[in-house]
Amino acid sequence: LIIGFGISGRHSITVTTVASAGNIGEDGILSCTFEPDIKLSDIVIQWLKEGVLGLVHEFKEGKDELSEQDEMFRGRTAVFADQVIVGNASLRLKNVQLTDAGTYKCYIITSKGKGNANLEYKTGAFSMPEVNVDYNASSETLRCEAPRWFPQPTVVWASQVDQGANFSEVSNTSFELNSENVTMKVVSVLYNVTINNTYSCMIENDIAKATGDIKVTESEIKRRSHLQLLNSKAS
């Protein structure tokens, strides 16, 4: 969380941003809130990106003002216009690109004053893994697959029964470049698995950490997956 305050001149207002990550090819949110104003026409929101010649987005007098928007953001940005009056200056960024990563500034002017706060936006690819029993294999084998990751993640296997065990000798991980030549499909195979145990396939890069669990018993297979974004700090 980053909390910024206004500078000289008028009074300062508090602006708060939260560091976040974007999944390339999908839509992302750059979060920013501020002390609200009574009149929408008195609110100016400017989103800037460090090292970019034009604006990322500008909202003033109740509508978008995009005459000085940088071409790399053209047609890809929107504020939540109906929420600006309550102090939400968050920006929706469509079709996140790898090059969208960087430092952004949320700059606010209201009748009360000015304020700004920066946020770090990371971009990459992350997806939920799915763990399945590989019935084609000669021995009991688990296969963990996740369709889109970038940068290249690490994959670690763990088991509930053998806690702390190192499975690197009995597993094999491969990374296959997807058709757009950026993201990769992650496939990890774990050999010699035992029945009545819960195994976890953990995939992690500097943006996200995802876990796929599988519990194999005589009678059933239970699966569970979850994904967590790393380093979501507010400013």
């Epitope: 090292g51 970019v52 010649l53």
Partner: antibody, heavy 122, light 107 residues
Framework: EVQLLESGGGLVQPGGSLRLSCAAS????????MSWVRQAPGKGLEWVSA????????YYADSVKGRFTISRDNSKNTLYLQMNSLRAEDTAVYYC???????????????WGQGTLVTVSS | DIQMTQSPSSLSASVGDRVTITCRAS??????LAWHQQKPGKAPKLLIY???SLESGVPSRFSGSGSGTDFTLTISSLQPEDFATYYC?????????FGQGTKVEIK
């Protein structure tokens, strides 16, 4: 201390190609857009091209669009200008300059290299 | 692209004179205007940015004013080291356009 050092200039025939480099030091290179500016002998300054800090946006003067390509390698703190289909009128001293950090806030063109001479002649 | 026109293209002045150079943009560039000084054989040097903000280390005899389409660079009392060529530059659009330059010579 901020330093910008251009290299790669020289004599080239019309229609030929050349790649200029600009090695930067003394500042966080990826935080700044960078520009190339040229000056023909005895003439004024002409902005040629710019690139955003992350390399996601590139901008060109009409006179070089389609012939020149600007790029950067932030891991090497280096800016490039690939010049193809060169013409006699491209003859100039080429300067790299540090461009803007934040739109509307920061100074720009506050540091320049010493320049590298490109001569296009048969 | 925004076109920048400087006037005069050259002027002769004496040490101690007050010198004014004007720059006109073909369309509004808000306050996104810089002034640079260049001496023969040297790289340009930034004097003024955002129309009127003095770059660090530049003497206070240099000042800039204006917004929109009309801008002015003033040297309040010309010094021997000020004889050079001065360029205005807009950065209100993605392109960065320079004026044609004003050469300040010794009278």
């Amino acid at each position: 201390e901020v330093q910008l050092l251009e290299s790669g200039g020289g004599l080239v025939q019309p229609g030929g190609s050349l790649r200029l480099s600009c090695a930067a030091s003394g500042f966080t290179f990826s935080s700044y857009a960078m520009s190339w500016v040229r000056q023909a002998p005895g003439k004024g300054l002409e902005w040629v091209s710019a690139i955003s800090g992350g390399g996601g946006s590139t901008y060109y003067a009409d006179s070089v669009k389609g012939r020149f390509t600007i790029s950067r390698d932030n891991s090497k703190n280096t800016l490039y200008l690939q010049m193809n289909s060169l013409r006699a009128e491209d003859t100039a001293v080429y300067y790299c300059a540090r461009d803007i950090q934040w739109y509307g806030e920061s100074t720009l063109f506050d540091y320049w290299g010493q320049g590298t001479l490109v001569t296009v002649s048969s | 692209d925004i076109q920048m026109t400087q006037s005069p293209s050259s002027l002769s002045a004496s040490v101690g004179d007050r010198v004014t150079i004007t720059c006109r943009a073909s369309q509004s560039t808000r306050s996104w205007l810089a002034w640079h000084q260049q001496k023969p054989g040297k790289a340009p040097k930034l004097l003024i940015y955002k129309a009127s903000s003095l770059e660090s280390g530049v003497p206070s005899r240099f000042s800039g004013s204006g917004s929109g389409t009309d801008f002015t660079l003033t040297i309040s009392s010309l010094q021997p080291e000020d004889f050079a060529t001065y360029y205005c530059q807009q950065y209100g659009s993605y392109s960065r356009t320079f004026g044609q330059g004003t050469k300040v010579e010794i009278k």
